[in-house]
């Protein structure tokens, strides 16, 4: 079968040909200093496409709390502080990795999952469809 | 110590009270249909705070390719298509989980890592500091 080269001292797995399960150390190395989106900036309030942050919580997932952005308006805020509907507020999405407990409630067994989250909003020129 | 309720049939770990290492199934469940940021939308070009996407690549990480947004301008694009420096283009950042091989080159042993990535840009009103 197809083998993956292994260093001496590496943990074994049940199937070296096509590893389905790996060991993951949860002592997270954090390259960042601030993890709270509300504390890290007030862009969500100052943006011309402002957004609210909603708490998406799932105790069977890691991280259990994810903040989801919801644009406040369909349009964008103009210089007068009014909503300009000639422009559009749209969510910026990012695909992220999470760990989901599987089977549920098992503390040491997880599955990798990819989910799409809205991180914030930006103001874009609309795509105008002209009718012939 | 604090114990986590366990289902019968859960894998054992060396410390059920405070699991440092867990088993992770790599059959990734993908709740999304489109994973490419350039293909998923053209917001990066249509935004009043447009950005470029730069490839952040690390073969020893999963995901190995992450797209990073860099705002094109300090200011924002106005209705005339010019840069208005009375407004600011700023990056929207998101903390994401990645997996890194540890020890290096071991195929089945990994560590979770948190990194901060810029997902896109938004246009904000600047904070003006008045000098007395």
């Amino acid at each position: 079968g197809i083998t993956i080269p292994r260093n001496p001292g590496c943990p074994n797995s049940e199937d070296k040909n096509f590893p389905r399960t790996v060991m993951v150390n949860l002592n997270i190395h954090n390259r960042n200093t601030n993890t709270n989106p509300k504390r890290s900036s007030d862009y969500y309030n100052r943006s011309t496409s402002p957004w609210n942050l909603h708490r998406n919580e799932d105790p069977e997932r890691y991280p259990s709390v994810i903040w989801e952005a919801k644009c406040r308006h369909l349009g964008c805020i103009n210089a007068d502080g009014n909503v300009d509907y000639h422009m559009n507020s749209v969510p910026i999405q990012q695909e992220i990795l999470v760990l989901r407990r599987e089977p549920p409630h098992c503390p040491n067994s997880f599955r990798l999952e990819k989910i799409l989250v809205s991180v914030g909003c930006t103001c874009v020129t609309p795509i105008v469809h002209h009718v012939a | 110590g604090i114990t986590i309720p366990r289902n019968p049939g859960c894998p054992n770990s060396e410390d059920k009270n405070f699991p440092r290492t867990v088993m992770v199934n790599l059959n990734i469940h993908n709740r999304n249909t489109n994973t490419n940021p350039k293909r998923s939308s053209d917001y990066y070009n249509r935004s009043t705070s447009p950005w470029n996407l730069h490839r952040n690549e690390d073969p020893e990480r999963y995901p190995s390719v992450i797209w990073e947004a860099k705002c094109r301008h300090l200011g924002c694009i106005n209705a005339d298509g010019n840069v208005d420096y009375h407004m600011n283009s700023v990056p929207i950042q998101q903390e994401i989980l990645v997996l890194r091989r540890e020890p290096p080159h071991c195929p089945n042993s990994f560590r979770l890592e948190k990194i901060l990535v810029s997902v896109g840009c938004t246009c904000v009103t600047p904070i003006v500091h008045h000098v007395a």
């Epitope: 096509f18 790996v22 | 790599l26 490839r55 073969p59 190995s64 390719v65 195929p107 990994f110």
Partner: nanobody, 118 residues
Framework: QVQLVESGGGLVQPGGSLRLSCAAS????????MSWVRQAPGKGLEWVAK????????DYVDSVKGRFTISRDNAKNSLFLQMNSLRAEDTAVYYC???????????WGQGTLVTVSS
């Protein structure tokens, strides 16, 4: 964006040969193990072959050993699979894949269909 585009598939008689190619872009091709994976009609994915970054190590699933040869050209960001002595059971969609650190595909192409039939 990461792109893998396979070509070279087609209809061939048992005992015949085909050479599959894969054009890669959007990542540093020479930094990754690359592989060919196939999916026969109604079956799951099956590893065919994989090759190390510099081409110094190659590995094959038992059923293709001695018949298939994987190779790469890092200067041209290309992966190849030379398939000789083809059999009916080699009929499948063949995918070019970029390996992740897990030793499983992180990205793959749309695939190219190989049909072995008389």
């Amino acid at each position: 964006q990461v792109q893998l585009v396979e070509s070279g598939g087609g209809l061939v008689q048992p005992g015949g040969s085909l050479r599959l190619s894969c054009a890669a872009s959007g990542f540093t091709f020479s930094s990754y193990w690359m592989s060919w994976v196939r999916q026969a009609p109604g079956k799951g994915l099956e590893w065919v072959a994989k090759i190390k970054q510099d081409g110094s190590e190659k590995d094959y699933v038992d059923s293709v050993k001695g018949r298939f040869t994987i190779s790469r050209d890092n200067a041209k960001n290309s992966l190849f699979l030379q398939m000789n002595s083809l059999r009916a059971e080699d009929t499948a969609v063949y995918y070019c894949a970029r390996e992740s650190i897990f030793g499983i595909p992180e990205d793959w192409g749309q695939g190219t269909l190989v049909t072995v039939s008389s």
